[in-house]
Interface confidence: medium
């Protein structure tokens, strides 16, 4: 028989981790593997039909994607949808496929909302998801004794899929649920330096453990301003939520990773500022199969998709699509063996959930909600060389933090700063001397109202739903 996979991904724009130029070669490799294995879908031919999730402008679209999905559904009656990856594109498609009872498999759609499988029934996420980042951050807080307060800053990028908005959403909700701590969150506009200064004054009043989701350049600028403002690593720690490790990518990712370095005359200060910085990324798979897969992926992309694939963590997404597709093929094979059909979406999906699988990305564990357990790395600066290296890995399956031998977290005072200052944020503890700004003076300098619409405390409601800003 014939089994049709309907692809709804960006076909023209190659900048997304789930662009077809990146995922296409991974699909080819997965299908070649299915064909080569007699135990997978024996007697079946798998074909792909392509549809774009982009608007005419070449960006992810919450209008184009569902229209494409409808066209593919009625024209080809696919057994499974692959993609979309973008949050705004995946949301309506996921609701349609749930209604049609057709499985949707993606390695994108990382937003918290897709975890609601009542709304997104039969949606399986074989890639990372932001709630899992919250698991990592919660484990980190437990390890370091931060159980009261955290602050999250995130950049608003107009006309975008709002990656930082959704990263923060997953982190915020999961950390709050896991630890029952206070998590404040502030949105800011990238590029507005005056605003950054105001932002850092708020930081002084609201946090010592700060998570920042922004571009590498913005993070560096904020670190420089923090140094200028006296927010040093003795009292503060700034985590850059740089999941794909863009700030760590030197030439081919092999040079010493110095995210503070720009050769712009500010490197000395930036180096000093980054003593207070740490970077959170996805963990690069370290199994030999992944390296071998990357080699094939890159060559296939170049020869058959006319696309030159760079090195980096972004390649874990095509790899996750590859593993997801093989997991799907396994689930269909099992469903058929038990008398089911390729259109039995519920049965196929259930066979993909709550199971482990050895893929090119290594050991892959799907949770009982159909979302992949995700591994993360924490990078810290070697004070000797200024190079960042992995000091801790988080194993999503075991929920354990694993230290990298020979590498320790670098704290200027030899220990992590407390998440709440000894005397409170406003020196409110009467036992302490009022040697910093008083509450009144601080409020005169800045209030939430002063920041106007640019700095908006996001509500839980916002974090649950996929609203454009």
């Amino acid at each position: 028989g014939n089994l049709t996979v309907a692809v709804v991904l960006p076909l023209a724009n190659t900048s997304y981790p789930w662009s077809w130029a990146r995922v296409g070669p991974a699909v080819e490799l997965a299908l070649a593997k299915v064909k080569a294995r007699p135990d997978l879908l024996p007697g079946w031919t798998v074909r792909t039909v392509l549809g774009s999730s982009e608007s005419a402008l070449g960006v992810c679209s919450d209008t184009a994607a569902p229209l494409t999905a409808v066209d593919l559904k009625w024209e080809h009656n696919p057994a499974v949808f692959l993609g979309p990856g973008c949050v705004y594109a995946a949301a309506p498609v996921g609701r349609f496929t749930a209604h049609w009872r057709v499985p949707l498999l993606t390695a994108g759609a990382p937003a918290l909302g897709f975890g609601a499988k009542d709304e997104y029934a039969l949606t399986t996420r074989a890639g990372p998801s932001h709630a899992k980042l919250g698991d990592f951050v919660a484990a980190l807080h437990r390890r370091l004794g931060w159980e009261r307060q955290a602050l999250v800053l995130y950049a608003y990028q107009p006309g975008d899929d709002q990656p930082c908005f959704f990263v923060v959403g997953g982190l915020y909700m999961r950390v709050r649920d896991r630890l029952n701590i206070t998590v404040d969150h502030l949105e800011f506009a990238e590029g507005d330096r005056d605003h950054y200064t105001l932002l850092l004054r708020t930081v002084r009043r609201k946090g010592r453990v700060i998570y920042i989701c922004s571009s590498p350049d913005t993070f560096r600028t904020l670190m420089l301003l923090a140094l200028e403002a006296g927010l040093s690593g003795e009292d503060y720690v700034f985590f850059h939520l740089d999941l794909f490790g863009h700030s760590l990518q030197g030439a081919h990712g092999l040079v010493p990773r110095r995210p503070w370095e720009r050769e712009d005359g500010q490197d000395v200060s930036a180096h000093q500022a980054f003593q207070a910085a740490k970077i959170i990324t996805y963990k690069e798979p370290d199994n030999p199969e992944y390296l071998e897969f990357l080699r094939k992926l890159k060559h296939l992309a170049r020869e058959q998709f006319n696309f030159t694939m760079e090195d980096g963590l972004v390649n874990t997404i095509p790899a996750a699509f590859h593993d997801g597709l093989l997991l799907y093929a396994q689930a269909v094979t099992e469903t058929l063996a038990h008398g089911g059909t390729v259109t039995d979406g519920e049965s196929i999906t259930q066979r993909m959930w709550n199971r482990s699988f050895q893929g090119v990305t290594g050991y892959l564990k799907m949770d009982s909600n159909g979302d992949r357990e995700t591994d993360f790395s924490l990078w810290d600066m070697d004070p000797e060389t200024g190079a960042f290296r992995v000091v801790l890995n988080f194993n999503g399956t075991s929920q354990e933090l694993v230290t990298v031998s020979g590498h320790t977290l670098n704290w200027p005072l030899g220990h992590p700063p407390p998440d709440v200052p000894r005397c409170g944020f406003d020196n409110e503890d009467p036992a302490c001397n009022q040697d910093h700004f008083s509450t009144l003076e601080e409020q005169k300098l800045i209030s939430e109202e002063d920041l106007g619409g640019e700095q908006k405390l996001i509500s839980e409601e916002d974090l649950h739903h996929h609203h454009h800003h």
């Epitope: 094939k296 296939l300 058959q304």
Partner: antibody, heavy 120, light 107 residues
Framework: EVQLVESGGGLVQPGGSLRLSCAAS????????MGWVRQAPGKGLEWVSS????????YYADPVKGRFTISRDNSKNTLYLQMNSLRAEDTAAYYC?????????????WGQGTLVTVSS | AIQMTQSPSSLSASVGDRVTITCRSS??????FGWYQQKPGKAPKLLIY???RLQSGVPSRFSGSGSGTDFTLTINNLQPEDFATYYC?????????FGPGTKVDIK
């Protein structure tokens, strides 16, 4: 059994042209990237050119760019190298090579080579 | 273009010896790298691909290691048929480039 048989080599004057052919058998020709590697007498190996299975992509080494053209005829399972404006330094044995992108095996099959001599 | 340097350019060894040849690339090439053996008058033969993967049919006394910029070919228990010239190749990016070769001859 995979076989690659080159032909078309010979003696040619500087500035002249030659067309090399490589007849392939024993594998799915269209699925493979094909290429040419040369070796000057007593010297090392030098990659010359490659072409993808779908004909869309061609690549050339700097010394031959603009003078050599790689092509293939998938219906005839044949690879070609059109060499124009030949120079003395193009004198070499030219090998036809395969590259299976699904396995990642680069240049795993080689022909026996055809000798091109550029001399006046 | 990426430059490949190979060392030594030649070496003399005896049957049963352990031989090590190294290759260095001018920039990081991950594991997009291979080793070839060529005997006089013959076409080269692929020994190792992806830096450390043994091509099928190649004896297990050949092994490859390395990633990034530094790569090694090791021949354990050198056999008479192993006396040949060995070339490394980067296929990380076009133009592909070979190393200058290492000639292994009988001591």
């Amino acid at each position: 059994e995979v076989q690659l048989v080159e032909s078309g080599g010979g003696l040619v004057q500087p500035g002249g042209s030659l067309r090399l052919s490589c007849a392939a058998s024993g594998f799915s020709f269209v699925s493979y990237v094909m290429g040419w590697v040369r070796q000057a007498p007593g010297k090392g190996l030098e990659w010359v050119s490659s072409i993808s299975g779908s004909l869309t992509n061609t690549y050339y080494a700097d010394p031959v760019k603009g003078r050599f053209t790689i092509s293939r005829d998938n219906s005839k399972n044949t690879l070609y190298l059109q060499m124009n404006s030949l120079r003395a330094e193009d004198t070499a044995a030219y090998y036809c090579v395969t590259y299976d992108i699904l396995t990642g095996h680069l240049f795993d099959y080689w022909g026996q080579g055809t000798l091109v001599t550029v001399s006046s | 273009a990426i430059q490949m340097t190979q060392s030594p350019s030649s070496l003399s060894a005896s049957v049963g010896d352990r031989v090590t040849i190294t290759c260095r690339s001018s920039q990081g090439i991950r594991n997009d790298f291979g080793w070839y053996q060529q005997k006089p008058g013959k076409a080269p033969k692929l020994l190792i691909y992806a830096a450390s993967r043994l091509q099928s049919g190649v004896p297990s006394r050949f092994s490859g290691s390395g990633s990034g910029t530094d790569f090694t070919l090791t021949i354990n228990n050198l056999q008479p048929e192993d006396f040949a010239t060995y070339y490394c190749l980067q296929d990380y990016t076009y133009p592909f480039t070979f190393g200058p070769g290492t000639k292994v001859d009988i001591k």
